[in-house]
């Protein structure tokens, strides 16, 4: 490990927010990746333990991929015997840090995503206020979640084939966690924000979606002004 001579110090996690999912339950035959992004000076080394013992490729059929540049452990086509606690140990001469992940391998039938009943819920908001729509997704397979807003094109809500016109407001990306995708936040709403919103969840089996409506009311001052204008 190289020592640059500046800011020498013990290892630390560079992306702790990416490490908060400590229990991973995945269907058999899927690929699993554990990451422990870290830094330190000198650059720390990373090693992996399974159930507290050194973990090497020959310990499992299909082997493992250790990507030191990405601080990751990859296991393809997981089987029930891969269940257990996986610990990354990151160390340099100034110290050592570790993180343990628990892997559960599921053998039940994967299904299309199940969305919690009643979510997202219809909302009524005052002009200029903030609104949150929630969507709770249950899926054996990794779901791909999108938030859509239904829009009109040339006065029509649907295309020639009957497909609704939608615009994607939020979708899975490199910097978006599953938790973040379960909430759609609208700030300082305008009358244009009123309409139908859809939470769409897909996996390798299929899609499921739930919709909700946002009604935007004028602010109270506007209501008062309207009343005064209408008085004799």
């Amino acid at each position: 490990a190289e020592d640059t001579g500046v800011d020498t110090g013990a290892p630390y996690w560079t992306r702790p927010e990416r490490m908060d999912k400590k229990l991973l339950a995945v269907p058999a035959a899927n690929t699993v990746r554990f990451r422990c992004p870290a830094a330190g000076n000198p650059t720390p080394s990373i090693s992996w333990l399974k159930n507290g013992r050194e973990f090497r490729g020959e310990h499992r059929i299909g082997g493992i991929k250790l990507r030191h540049q990405q601080w990751s452990l990859v296991m393809e086509s997981v089987v029930p015997s891969d269940r257990g606690n996986y610990t990354c140990v990151v160390e340099n001469k100034f110290g050592s840090i570790r993180q343990t992940y628990t892997l559960d391998v599921l053998e039940r039938s994967p299904h299309r995503p199940i969305l919690q009943a009643g979510l997202p819920a219809n909302q009524t908001a005052v002009l200029g206020s903030d609104v949150e729509f929630h969507c709770k997704v249950y899926s054996d397979a990794q779901p791909h979640i999108q938030w859509l807003k239904h829009v009109e094109v040339n006065g029509s809500k649907v295309g020639p084939d009957g497909t609704p016109y939608v615009t994607v407001l939020k979708t899975a990306g490199a910097n978006t966690t599953d938790k973040e995708l379960e909430v759609l936040s609208l700030h300082n709403v305008t009358f244009e924000d009123a309409g139908e919103y859809t939470c769409l969840a897909g996996n390798s089996i299929g899609f499921s979606h739930h919709s909700a409506w946002l009604v935007v009311l004028p602010a109270e001052e506007e209501l008062v002004e309207a009343d005064e204008a209408g008085s004799v």
Epitope: L115, H144, N203
Partner: antibody
Framework: EVQLLESGGGVVQPGRSLRLSCAAS????????MHWVRQAPGKGLEWVAV????????YYADSVKGRFTISRDNSKNTLSLQMNSLRVEDTAIYYC?????????????????WGQGTMVTVSS | DIVMTQTPLSLSVTPGQPASISCRSS???????????VYWYVQKSGQPPQLLIY???NRFSGVPDRFSGSGSRTDFTLKISRVEAEDVGVYYC?????????FGGGTKVEIK
């Protein structure tokens, strides 16, 4: 035109291996899950396996689990099925089928486009 | 696994007459999003299956309106209002809720 074209079928002895391929065209292959379905001569349809759009999720029928491996190469618009330890009962026409895509489903969310199939015969 | 049971095994129909095929699932196919994920296919001799009906009752593009799907939860029906000679083939129902995806055993439709 949306098309799926299977290849790689043939006659093979029990215990041997075979690799099937499916070339996709006319749609954004990398946005769709893909399936294999088979049909034994004179019999009904049996689902074999599925792979997610990015290859990270794979599921198999119990009858092929541990013997067959589904994979994909999105850069080449190709789906594959590696079949090992073949048995006489694996004899069938193997169809490549388009699964669920990304985005708001326009009509059915998959299982709408089937290839013509490729015949696999396992016989001693 | 969800078992799909199809009846009858075969059907001989006079052209212009209606035909009905039943399919029963061992579990409800009504999903949390309110849709019922049963699909219907026809397979003509030497060809791959062709999609007719998706999500219980939606006709796939290009499918004649003499084909219709109905039912609820575990009992489903495919109806052909007036059978034509070109409708000959084997008809299959399929559940698209969970893996393994499963098909009915098929119903062979012939013309009298």
């Amino acid at each position: 035109e949306v098309q799926l074209l299977e290849s790689g079928g043939g006659v093979v002895q029990p215990g041997r291996s075979l690799r099937l391929s499916c070339a996709a065209s006319g749609f954004t292959f990398s946005s769709y899950a893909m399936h294999w379905v088979r049909q034994a001569p004179g019999k009904g349809l049996e689902w074999v396996a599925v792979i997610s759009y990015d290859g990270s999720n794979k599921y198999y029928a119990d009858s092929v689990k541990g013997r067959f491996t589904i994979s994909r190469d999105n850069s080449k618009n190709t789906l594959s099925l590696q079949m090992n330890s073949l048995r006489v009962e694996d004899t069938a026409i193997y169809y490549c089928v388009r699964g669920a895509g990304h985005g708001f489903p326009t009509g059915p969310d998959g299982f709408d486009i089937w290839g013509q199939g490729t015949m696999v015969t396992v016989s001693s | 696994d969800i078992v799909m049971t199809q009846t009858p095994l075969s059907l001989s129909v006079t052209p212009g007459q209606p035909a009905s095929i039943s399919c029963r699932s061992s579990r409800s196919l009504l999903h949390s999003d309110g849709k019922t994920y049963v699909y219907w296919y026809v397979q003509k001799s030497g060809q791959p299956p062709q999609l007719l009906i998706y999500e219980l009752s939606n006709r796939f593009s290009g499918v004649p309106d003499r084909f219709s799907g109905s039912g609820s939860r575990t009992d489903f029906t495919l109806k052909i209002s007036r059978v034509e000679a070109e409708d000959v083939g084997v008809y299959y129902c399929m559940q698209y809720v969970e893996a393994p995806l499963t098909f009915g055993g098929g119903t062979k439709v012939e013309i009298k």
